[in-house]
């Protein structure tokens, strides 16, 4: 009955500080409504980093000034962060909420550690 | 540093209504989902209701169902349950609590006692 | 709606003595578990999440286990501050039920 979520131990951002990975939830119930929230963990502190609920089968919106984008299929969620830099680089945890019908369901990754090295500035050049 | 203060107990006759208030700050209050939890003198924990960050979903307790409703202001960073048609059994202290991002309550208030009794 | 059952109800024990209590869920919550501590006249405090994640501040004595359905919180060596009651919470899924409690006592 409990709900499981799988999510990558480790992802490498892109030179453009993107990241992408997939967030998947065994589901113990026939749910419509799904919201997906990534957190960061940074020592103690647990922050949200961006939320989006959506309808099975429908796509994922977040907001607009979000940092994240994302796809959905299934119990299957793609999920990319834009934007990051050497600092932004933690555990990132994928939260799933089972939202509608009842019962309410939760389920947490055990977090994806997303390393993001900042490009080198390129050499001036005569 | 966070904070949650209870307000709007008091002694009430059974059948009769009471509004309570939880006033949150030291937090972004319209990020979290707060519950109410309940303990009757002398006895243990008991959940009643939540409401979500937003207001956009609702649960509560079977013994509660019907008669009481949570609601929030964000704008007043402010918490609320109306209870209606009280009864004895409802008699306890009544805490509002944080649902952390990860799950659990990890702030409460300090309770308000709600009698009711004729 | 997920039961939880706690064992014992009441302790007494010594300073200084390994304290254990269990929590049955009365279905697999994973590690969905919360444990509490409500001193006599004060209010519940989270102690440990996720079953055995340490609460920030909370002293490295408290430790908690399992997965599914059983848990256990342990008190490896008990002091005068920790008499209190000890509640374990599901939040898995609605309700977030509570178990009924264990008292702790010293001797």
């Known amino acids: 009955k409990a709900m499981h979520v799988a999510q990558p131990a480790v992802v490498l951002a892109n030179s453009r500080g993107t990241a992408s990975f997939v967030c998947e939830y065994a589901s113990p119930g026939k749910a419509t409504e799904v919201r997906v929230t990534v957190l960061r963990q940074a020592d103690s502190q647990v922050t949200e980093v961006c939320a989006a609920t959506y309808m099975m089968g429908n796509e994922l919106t977040f907001l607009d000034d979000s940092i994240c984008t994302g796809t959905s299929s299934g119990n299957q969620v793609n999920l990319t962060i834009q934007g990051l830099r050497a600092m932004d680089t933690g555990l990132y945890i994928c939260k799933v909420e089972l939202m509608y019908p009842p019962p309410y369901y939760m389920g947490i990754g055990n977090g994806t550690q997303i390393y993001v090295i900042d490009p080198e500035p390129c050499p001036d050049s005569d | 540093q966070v904070q949650l203060v209870e307000s709007g107990g008091g002694v009430v006759q059974p059948g009769r209504s009471l509004r309570l208030s939880c006033a949150a700050s030291g937090f972004t209050f319209s990020s979290y989902g707060i519950h109410w939890v309940r303990q009757a003198p002398g006895k243990g924990l008991e959940w009643v209701a939540v409401?979500?960050?937003?207001?956009?979903?609702?649960y509560y307790a079977d013994s509660v169902k019907g008669r009481f409703t949570i609601s929030r202001d964000n704008s007043k960073n402010t918490l609320y349950l109306q209870m209606n048609s009280l009864r004895a059994e409802d008699t306890a202290v009544y805490y509002c609590?944080?649902?952390?991002?990860?799950?659990?309550?990890?702030?409460w208030g300090q309770g308000t006692l709600v009698t009711v009794s004729s | 709606d997920i039961q939880m059952t706690q064992s014992p109800s009441s302790l007494s024990a010594s300073v200084g003595d390994r304290v254990t209590i269990t929590c049955r869920a009365s279905?697999?919550?994973?590690?969905?578990l919360a444990w509490y501590q409500q001193k006599p006249g004060k209010v519940p405090k989270l102690l440990i999440y996720?079953?055995?994640t340490l609460q920030s501040g909370v002293p490295s004595r408290f430790s908690g286990s399992g997965s599914g359905t059983d848990f256990t919180l342990t008190i490896s060596s008990l002091q005068p501050e920790d008499v209190a009651t000890y509640y374990c919470?599901?939040?898995?899924?609605?309700?977030?039920?509570f178990g009924q409690g264990t008292k702790v006592e010293i001797k």
């Open positions: 409401i979500w960050y937003d207001g956009s979903n609702k």
């Open positions: 996720a079953a055995s």
């Open positions: 609590a944080r649902g952390s991002l990860l799950g659990p309550f990890d702030y």
């Open positions: 279905q697999g919550i994973s590690n969905y």
């Open positions: 919470q599901n939040y898995n899924s609605a309700p977030w039920t």
